[in-house]
């Protein structure tokens, strides 16, 4: 069962796995959640009654019964991991800790104007896990305004001590705020010859890459496939690092694959969720339970529902044996990966889906789209919403996109003349406008947040957020779309679609069925030539056919320009402005969402 509250002056007895240092009990809970085995923890706060060497210790614990005896102890704070919870979890920690020095390897020292600048530096440095910044009030003159970037093997401090006039904090890479490049390519027949920081067993290079991504020290990896000549190294995933942050040597070797940590793309692709099944593959590990199951899918469900289960192997039933049920072996290990992977024994293996909630909901695969035609089908664009105004009469005003369970991203120009959020209604999961009746459920709007630099659509900053009064429960017909990663700025999107209920031609009427059009992106240079009277800035993106005929139009405003990249849909643009509708040689101009990721996160993550 999910227990989120912390237990003050309480210590869990026994079950210790490891001890780490964290600046708060709240962060200890996050570390426990992300640890492959931790189910409970005990954190020691600073206290005069406690030995200072025990301050800030976070003891990660496990228990077969999922609980441990409680003992009263002053300054101890205990709790449970979020593994047992169904809600979305994130490792993002923006807190700044005053008068705390988080110890680690100080590998970079430089002057910074503020703690924020120091944190940004850490976020954009490939090695940095956390930082300590000496403020201008720091007693030692030569250390004032010094920003120390730090890393450790575990990603958490090796010790935390009290130190006046310093502040510490963590890298915001896990908040999608890094400007580091997002390199998704996996290089076949390649070995990266750099130092290994760890090795695990993985069924394929994709799982290896995802393991590298959430391993604190891993920057790139090499995976030896099951055809690798050296038997003892088959399915081996080598997690690697280097001083420069890049592989120093690439060696051509067949049956090996290499790639990079996806830490700069983790908000727009799954990095925890290993959802595939591996046929004729057995995963070895500590056995947790053996249960009868009808199929490998049912076995995966059983593993997902058993909080300690990390992976499984299913052996299908022999003929009519056991009511057609096979054996489902629920397993675990110290690091969450199989201790060995065997092939040719007929098993079907896979991983728990419990970790999927650590990934952004937007990375969930949606049902295959219908190719061709202009009318959409239900569930094809589950992030698309229709924004209605009720004044003077109810009508479709603009499109918008679900980007979080309480957030809609749309265009600022939609709110010209809108005096209050009270007159707005957001309808999600809608295909036809005619579905909207008096009693159709909608989301009220609590707040309209318009970019403060917005003046008019053509000048840019045409972006707005709607904070909903209630949260959206994600289903197949209403779910979020991923924001593009800042590390993806150089990606060339080739599968882009504009959707909306807008006019199909100038002086038309709003369409009943959600329309879709596949449109290519146009370079800003090319676009600028078409719009000589407007500055096409890097904060805008253009799309449209040379021959015209497909474009966004009035009523599509605020809606998404959605592009599919690596099987995940990204909100690349917001329909903003353009000349007419599908005018030949006049591409549509969209707000370039990647340039506003910081603004979006600042507004949506504000406490």
């Amino acid at each position: 069962e999910c227990v989120t509250q912390l237990l003050k002056d309480t210590c869990f007895e026994g079950g210790d796995i490891t001890t780490v240092f964290t600046p708060s009990a709240k962060y200890c809970q996050v570390v426990c959640t992300y640890h492959p085995r931790c189910l409970l923890f005990t954190f020691t706060a600073e206290s005069p009654s406690e030995d200072p060497t025990r301050w800030f210790t976070c003891v990660l614990k496990d228990s077969v019964t999922e609980t441990l005896p409680r003992v009263n102890r002053t300054a101890a704070i205990s709790g449970y991991s979020f593994k047992q919870c169904s809600h979305q979890i994130s490792a993002c920690n923006k807190d700044i800790y005053v008068d705390l020095d988080m110890k680690g390897i100080n590998y970079n020292s430089s002057v910074a104007k503020s703690a924020q600048e120091c944190q940004e530096r850490c976020t954009d440095d490939v090695h940095c896990h956390f930082f300590t910044y000496a403020t201008r009030q720091f007693p030692s003159l030569e250390h004032r305004n010094i920003c120390l970037l730090k890393h450790t093997q575990t990603g958490t401090p090796t010790r935390i001590t009290k130190l006046d006039k310093v502040v510490s904090g963590f890298s915001l890479k896990s908040c999608a705020l890094s400007n580091l490049a997002c390199i998704r390519d996996i290089f076949p027949n390649t070995v990266f010859a750099d130092s290994n920081i760890d090795s695990v067993m993985a069924p394929d290079a994709f799982v290896c890459g995802r393991i590298c991504t959430h391993h604190p020290g891993c920057l790139f990896f090499t995976f030896f496939s099951q055809e690798w000549p050296k038997e003892s190294q088959r399915n081996l995933c080598l997690l690697k690092t280097s001083e420069s942050g890049l592989p120093s040597t690439r060696i051509k070797k067949s049956k090996a694959l290499s790639g990079f940590s996806l830490q700069s793309c983790r908000h727009s692709i799954p990095v925890f969720c290993h959802s595939s099944f591996y046929h004729d593959t057995d995963f070895l590990g500590e056995e947790l339970d053996i249960v009868a199951a009808k199929s490998h899918e049912a076995c995966q469900k059983l593993c997902t529902n058993a909080v300690r289960c990390q992976f499984f192997t299913y052996t299908p039933a022999q003929a009519s044996c056991n009511e057609g049920k096979g054996k489902c072996y629920l397993k675990l290990s110290s690091n969450g990966s199989p201790t060995k992977i065997l092939h040719g024994r007929g098993g079907i293996s896979g991983y728990t889906l419990r970790l999927c909630k650590m990934d952004n909901e937007c990375t969930t695969k949606i049902k295959p789209r219908i190719v061709g035609g202009t009318a959409s089908v239900r569930g094809e664009w589950p992030w698309q919403v229709t924004l209605h105004t009720t004044s003077p009469t109810q009508r479709h005003l603009c499109g918008g996109s679900i980007i979080g369970n309480q957030w809609i991203l749309t265009a600022a120009h939609c709110f010209y003349g809108v005096e209050s959020p009270k007159i707005l209604r957001v309808y999600s999961g809608i295909l036809n406008q005619s579905e909207i009746k008096e009693d159709t459920s909608f989301f009220g709007v609590q707040e309209i947040i318009i970019h403060d630099q917005y003046k008019m659509a053509e000048s840019g900053y045409d972006i707005a957020l709607l904070k909903l009064e209630t949260t959206v429960n994600y289903t197949d017909s209403q779910r979020p779309i991923c924001l593009p990663s800042k590390g993806d700025r150089n990606v060339i999107y080739t599968d882009c679609w504009v959707t909306g209920w807008g006019y199909r031609k100038l002086r038309d009427k709003i369409q009943n069925t959600l329309q879709k059009a596949k449109i290519p992106l146009v370079t800003n240079e090319e676009c600028q030539k078409r719009y000589r009277g407007h500055k096409i800035t890097h904060k805008m993106i253009c799309a449209g056919y040379r021959e015209g005929g497909k474009d966004a139009c009035k009523g599509d405003s605020g809606g998404p320009l959605s592009c599919k990249h690596n099987e995940v849909w990204h909100l690349v643009g917001i329909t903003s402005w353009g000349e007419g509708c599908a005018q030949r040689e006049r591409p549509g101009v969209y707000t370039n969402v990647v340039e506003y990721v910081d603004w979006i996160l600042e507004k949506t993550q504000a406490v």
């Epitope: 407007h534 500055k535 040689e585």
Partner: antibody, heavy 120, light 107 residues
Framework: QVQLVQSGAEVKKPGASVKVSCKAS????????IEWVRQAPGQGLEWIGV????????NYNENFKDRATLTADTSISTAYMELSRLRSDDTAVYFC?????????????WGQGTTVTVSS | DIVMTQSPDSLAVSLGERATINCKAS??????VAWYQQKPGQPPKLLIY???NRYTGVPDRFSGSGSGTDFTLTISSLQAEDVAVYFC?????????FGGGTKLEIK
């Protein structure tokens, strides 16, 4: 009705500057672009640049980039074109025109033209 | 820059006869072509935009055609008041450029 009225003829010496005005009426000044085009005696038409009075954004022909300055005063619906470091080959009739499309297109209304003579 | 080459430089046509003026672009300009008429001492006047769309108040004896790089202005039955210089213009790519002009006279 839409009208663009330009300032009167100018005679200038080489090296000097000239500023031509173009007063718009009969439409919303900030909703259309103002283009500047010149025509040397017996010659064709040459585009100088464009100003968007709504945003103040200007875009120049490379040939005029370092000598022409386009401005607009929205309070009096007037656009200006200033050409500096005049040469004798700048002798021409200078026209302002409104674009047919909001974002740059055919020029549907023209001013009557301002003759600029550059002579020592 | 895109070069617009007009032909012929001058043309003499009898009253009531058809006059045809051609314009060739140095690269494809899609449908972003306009035609203007200019009489002595006057500014140019828009006749045709987007290749073939007649501007408000333009008589229907004026028509435009073409695609890609080759465009034509046709006056189906020449009138005395049509004596003027005619210019084509591309609006496909900045900077907009004009043809050198065709002087139309009565034969």
């Amino acid at each position: 009705q839409v009208q663009l009225v330009q300032s009167g003829a100018e005679v200038k010496k080489p090296g000097a500057s000239v500023k031509v005005s173009c007063k718009a009426s009969g439409y919303t000044f900030t909703n259309y672009l103002i283009e500047w085009v010149r025509q040397a005696p017996g010659q064709g038409l040459e585009w100088i640049g464009v100003i968007n009075p709504g945003s103040g954004y200007t875009n120049y022909n490379e040939n005029f980039k370092d000598r022409a300055t386009l401005t607009a005063d929205t309070s009096i619906s007037t656009a200006y074109m200033e050409l500096s470091r005049l040469r004798s080959d700048d002798t021409a009739v200078y026209f302002c025109a409104r674009t047919y499309g909001k974002y740059g297109g055919a020029m549907d209304f023209w001013g009557q033209g301002t003759t600029v003579t550059v002579s020592s | 820059d895109i070069v617009m080459t007009q032909s012929p430089d001058s043309l003499a046509v009898s009253l009531g006869e058809r006059a045809t003026i051609n314009c060739k672009a140095s690269q494809s300009v899609s449908n972003d072509v306009a035609w203007y008429q200019q009489k002595p001492g006057q500014p140019p006047k828009l006749l045709i935009y987007y290749i073939s769309n007649r501007y408000t108040g333009v008589p229907d004896r004026f028509s435009g055609s073409g695609s890609g790089t080759d465009f034509t202005l046709t006056i189906s039955s020449l009138q005395a008041e049509d004596v003027a210089v005619y210019f084509c213009q591309q609006d496909y790519s900045s900077p907009p450029t004009f043809g050198g002009g065709t002087k139309l006279e009565i034969k």
